[in-house]
């Protein structure tokens, strides 16, 4: 279920969820539907200061790189 994740524990969880894709601490600019003027919220704020779930963690994974064509 949802839980708070801080420090190295949060990094470990992100590495597990995102794997080789890597992850962002902040959502890239223009990510999602939030207003441009809204303060930037990062994974720390969303998962250390309140409970978050797997879906929330996945939002901070870097996008999959397209496979190179042969």
């Amino acid at each position: 279920g949802p839980e708070t994740l801080c420090g190295a524990e949060l990094v470990d969880a992100l590495q597990f969820v995102c794997g080789d894709r890597g992850f962002y601490f902040n959502k890239p600019t223009g990510y999602g539907s939030s207003s441009r003027r809204a303060p930037q919220t990062g994974i720390v704020d969303e998962c250390c200061f309140r409970s978050c779930d797997l879906r929330r963690l996945e939002m901070y994974c870097a996008p999959l790189k397209p496979a190179k064509s042969a």
Epitope: C6, E9, L10, P39, V44, D45, F49, R50
Partner: antibody
């Protein structure tokens, strides 16, 4: 058990930059979140900002333009710089740690460093 | 003016129960962000008293308890003792400010 110790000049002139260092013992600086908080004389606590060693930072919007936080993992230290200080920046400055076992609560604090801004 | 509102002072006689409230809004406590409570004696650093709304760190007596409901939180102290006389601060995260926020603090006086 993580322990924190603030150090730096106790007196800073107006318009200059306040610099403080927090030395961490008993734990790795790369494992936790680190924070600075201040308390003006006779007043309440004010959050200055926090950061993770990877470079993730978050500063109080009211201080953001003047604040820089950095980390030296080799010395297990992190620092605070506050530029263009005025008398309103006179306060006890605390470094604190969020170890992750307390749901974001700051569970370890330094003893505080008193900084006076005066010419 | 603090984002989290606390009464400036509260008092009680030894053995009594007192509560200290912390009122926020929909961008902090009401948004599901955890509330933490700190105890501070004069001339010393704050100490974490309650974390994650209602959890006590080891070493904190069970006379101290925390709760949260809607946009506010409360710290309750039962069996009040003289050594409980201190300042108490609540803290949470505010999404509209994108940062942590403290209450203005409540000074607890134990009548005696």
């Amino acid at each position: 058990q993580v322990q924190l110790q603030e150090s730096g000049p106790g007196l800073v002139k107006p318009s200059e930059t306040l610099s403080l260092t927090c030395t961490v013992s008993g734990g790795s600086i790369s494992s936790y979140y680190w924070s600075w908080i201040r308390q003006p004389p006779g007043r309440g606590l004010e959050w200055i900002g926090y950061f993770f060693y990877s470079g993730y930072t978050n500063y109080n919007p009211s201080l953001k333009s003047r604040v820089t936080m950095s980390v030296d993992t080799s010395k297990n230290q992190f620092s605070l710089k506050l530029s263009s200080v005025t008398a309103a920046d006179t306060a006890v400055y605390y470094c604190a740690c969020i170890t992750g076992t307390t749901k974001g609560g700051m569970d370890v604090w330094g003893q505080g460093a008193t900084v006076t801004v005066s010419s | 003016q603090s984002v989290l509102t606390q009464a400036p002072s509260v008092s009680g006689a030894p053995g009594q129960r007192v509560t200290i409230s912390c009122t926020g809004r929909s961008s902090n406590i009401g948004a599901g962000y955890d509330v933490h409570w700190y105890q501070q004696f004069p001339g010393t650093a704050p100490k974490l008293l309650i974390y994650g709304n209602s959890n006590r760190p080891s070493g904190v007596p069970d006379r101290f308890s925390g709760s949260k409901s809607g946009t506010s939180a409360s710290l309750a102290i039962t069996g009040l003792q003289a050594e409980d006389e201190a300042d108490y601060y609540c803290q949470s995260y505010d999404s509209s400010l994108s940062g942590s926020v403290f209450g203005g603090g409540t000074k607890l006086t134990v009548l005696g």
